[in-house]
Interface confidence: low
């Protein structure tokens, strides 16, 4: 009797794991075995698919085979008894194309009021995503164990901290990975529990917060007993987004190891341009508290929050500022690749009544004013980028006398 | 003024290991990267990986991963490559450079090289 | 892994010539470029570091430039120990990677 060749073959691809199903096309005939071939783009040989040969069910494996995943394959299958059945040859496809995303691994770590979550990027060590892991986003649902209100936290990081938590809760969370390009995303992970610790009798440090003086950089942070030493580490934030780079470092800043005030100050150049992580801990000699959160920290726009510079030219009713880049030591400008919002804050010099504009612009007047009259003028640079939502420090107030009348030409 | 200091040469057998040496001296050992570059007769150069004195830290470049093991000895300064199962394809220059600071300047520059080890792979 | 392209393999050039070499990475690198100088028998020499920083030592007749993928090294009048070979390296991202050098020789 005639094999007749299989039907209906289907090839799943979940990140690295390559399983073919297929349909047995004569179910009364026993003792049938299927045998795979593979042909790569632009070979007219075909080749044996290790792992699905001479298979007696109808489901292979063949993820041991090293494929190049961007590269179109072919297979065709037959079935084979005494004698073979012709082959049937299954739809061209890309690895790459074809494949789905998986859920990526968790590992969870807990804190008193916060989890650590620390994911591995679908594929870990495998081929098909191995270019592709900065580009994953991640979707974290998490929920007290006892309540079925979940909250979602999108995150670009492979170590996010969850925090604001309950100490001694148990929560539960699921995460699944989402590649924005390509228009893929896995299943949730497996739900994770982890029960937070008792609270610590040291919190961590709040309120980070990062400015400029002279040339040094100023942290400081708010703390709720006095009498602790303190000490600040930074990360570059590329590094939490590298999955490669699970075992990233901390490093101490020096100028920030076991410091007794709730500041410290360090050199400008401890750091090139770029963006960081800092994260401060406290300790009473005994005691150690878990890490705060984390800050980003700018180093461009650090630099570019210095006050704003200006000049002003008076008129009889009004003053014409021209905004500058505010100066480093050495009279050098401070370049400015950021969009900045200026706001101007005017007073006459015998009243306490402020008048304020907001102006992105870099020459602004400042209208409906008395001739002869001294004004007093302050500012301010913000920055536009809602996720670095900053401010300098006012610049020193200027005053200056308007002209007498008919000068506003 | 920083120094790093490495042996001429060495001439090694097919399948044996070599472990080549580098010796630094005027700046904090502990505080910077120590890089690997291998550079092949008449070729480019190639990083190998690099080591953190500090915790022995290490990043490779996973063509040179079973190759190459990288450590340090901080007591005397010294960061070591060990090569193993040398064949004619290794014989090249291995020069250590000075890399980033592990504080101040994580990603910073190669700025000072040893004179580099010739290797020899020969019968 | 970041692919480092000089544009040229050779240069034959004269001296006083102004001379310019090309480096294009496969993606951005924020700057983290260094150029180095290699004389036959000798180990690199940093010349330039962060794209554009000249190191301390290196003759004000080298600079160099550039931003995201594409930077250039510039000899403005070129003098006779300035013959070697030039290689640009990335540092941005592990593993470090080398462009394939450019050799000078006079004409």
């Known amino acids: 009797k005639n094999l007749k060749s299989p039907q209906k073959v289907e090839v799943d691809i979940i990140d690295d794991n390559f399983i073919l199903r297929w349909n047995r096309s004569d179910e009364s005939v026993g003792n049938v075995t299927f045998s795979f071939d593979y042909q790569k783009t632009g070979m007219d040989n075909w080749i044996k698919l290790s792992g699905c040969q001479n298979i007696t069910s109808t489901k292979c494996n063949f993820s041991s085979l090293k494929l190049n995943v961007y590269e179109e394959i072919k297979l065709r299958i037959r079935a084979e008894k005494e004698n073979t059945s012709s082959w049937y040859e299954v739809d061209s496809f890309t690895p790459f194309r074809k494949a789905q995303i998986g859920p990526p691994e968790v590992h969870l770590e807990a804190e008193d009021k916060a989890i650590v979550i620390h994911i591995s990027p679908p594929g870990q060590d495998g081929n098909m995503w191995a270019l592709e892991k900065p580009s994953f986003s991640y979707t974290i649902r998490i929920w007290q164990k006892s309540s079925s209100d979940k909250k979602t936290i999108n995150s670009t990081y492979y170590v996010e901290k969850i925090p604001e938590l309950l100490p001694e809760t148990t929560y539960c969370l699921e995460v699944k990975a989402i590649h924005p390009s390509l228009k893929k995303h896995s299943n949730y992970s497996p739900v994770h529990c982890i029960k937070t610790t008792v609270e610590n009798e040291l919190p961590p440090p709040e309120n980070i917060e990062v400015s400029v003086q002279n040339q040094n950089y100023v942290l400081k942070w708010d703390y709720t007993y006095a009498n602790m030493t303190f000490q600040v580490q930074w990360l570059h934030a590329f590094l939490k987004r590298n999955p490669g780079n699970h075992l990233y470092k901390w490093k101490q800043i020096p100028d920030c190891e076991n410091v007794k005030t709730t500041q410290c100050v360090f050199p400008q150049n401890v750091f090139q341009k770029g963006i960081y992580l800092l994260r401060v801990q406290a300790s009473d000699g005994n005691n150690t508290s878990f890490w705060s959160e984390e800050i980003k920290f700018d180093t461009e726009i650090q630099a570019f929050l210095l006050p704003p510079v200006f000049n002003i030219r008076s008129l009889s009713d009004s003053f014409h500022i021209y905004i500058g880049a505010p100066k480093q030591s050495g009279n050098t400008p401070v370049i400015q690749d950021y969009p900045l919002i200026y706001e101007i804050i005017f007073w006459e010099n015998t009243s306490n009544a402020e008048r304020k504009i907001i102006e992105k612009k870099t020459d602004v007047t400042v209208p409906n004013l008395k001739p002869l009259t001294v004004y007093c003028v302050k500012a301010r640079a913000h920055t536009m980028d809602e996720k670095l939502n900053k401010s300098s420090v006012f610049s020193d107030a200027v005053c200056e006398k308007t002209k007498p009348g008919n000068t506003s030409k | 003024q920083v120094q790093l200091q490495q042996p001429g040469t060495e001439l090694v057998k097919p399948g044996s290991p070599v472990k080549l040496s580098c010796k630094a001296s005027?700046?904090?050992?502990?505080?910077?990267?120590l890089n690997w570059v291998q550079q092949r007769p008449g070729r480019g150069l190639e990083w190998i990986g690099k080591?953190?004195?500090?915790?022995?830290?290490?990043r490779y470049n996973q063509k040179f991963k079973d190759k190459a093991t990288l450590t340090v000895d901080k007591s005397s300064n010294t960061a070591y490559i060990q090569l193993s199962s040398l064949t004619s394809e290794d014989s090249a220059v291995y020069y250590c450079?000075?890399?980033?600071?592990?504080?101040?300047?994580?990603?910073?520059?190669?700025?000072?090289w040893g004179q580099g080890t010739s290797v020899t792979v020969s019968s | 892994d970041i692919q480092m392209t000089q544009s040229s393999s050779s240069f034959s050039v004269s001296l006083g010539d102004r001379l310019t070499i090309t480096c294009k990475a496969s993606e951005v690198i924020y700057n983290r470029l260094a150029w180095f100088q290699q004389k036959p028998g000798n180990a690199p020499r940093l010349l330039i570091s962060g794209a554009t920083s000249l190191e301390t030592g290196v003759p004000s007749r080298f600079s160099g430039s550039g931003s995201r993928k594409d930077y250039t090294l510039s000899i403005s009048s070129l003098q006779t120990e300035d013959v070697a070979t030039y290689y640009c390296?990335?540092?941005?991202?592990?593993?470090?990677?080398f462009g394939s050098g450019t050799k000078l020789e006079i004409k």
């Open positions: 390296q990335q540092y941005w991202s592990s593993p470090f990677t």
């Open positions: 005027g700046y904090t050992f502990t505080s910077f990267w």
């Open positions: 080591i953190d004195p500090s915790d022995s830290e290490i």
């Open positions: 450079a000075r890399g980033g600071g592990i504080y101040y300047d994580y990603d910073g520059a190669m700025d000072y």
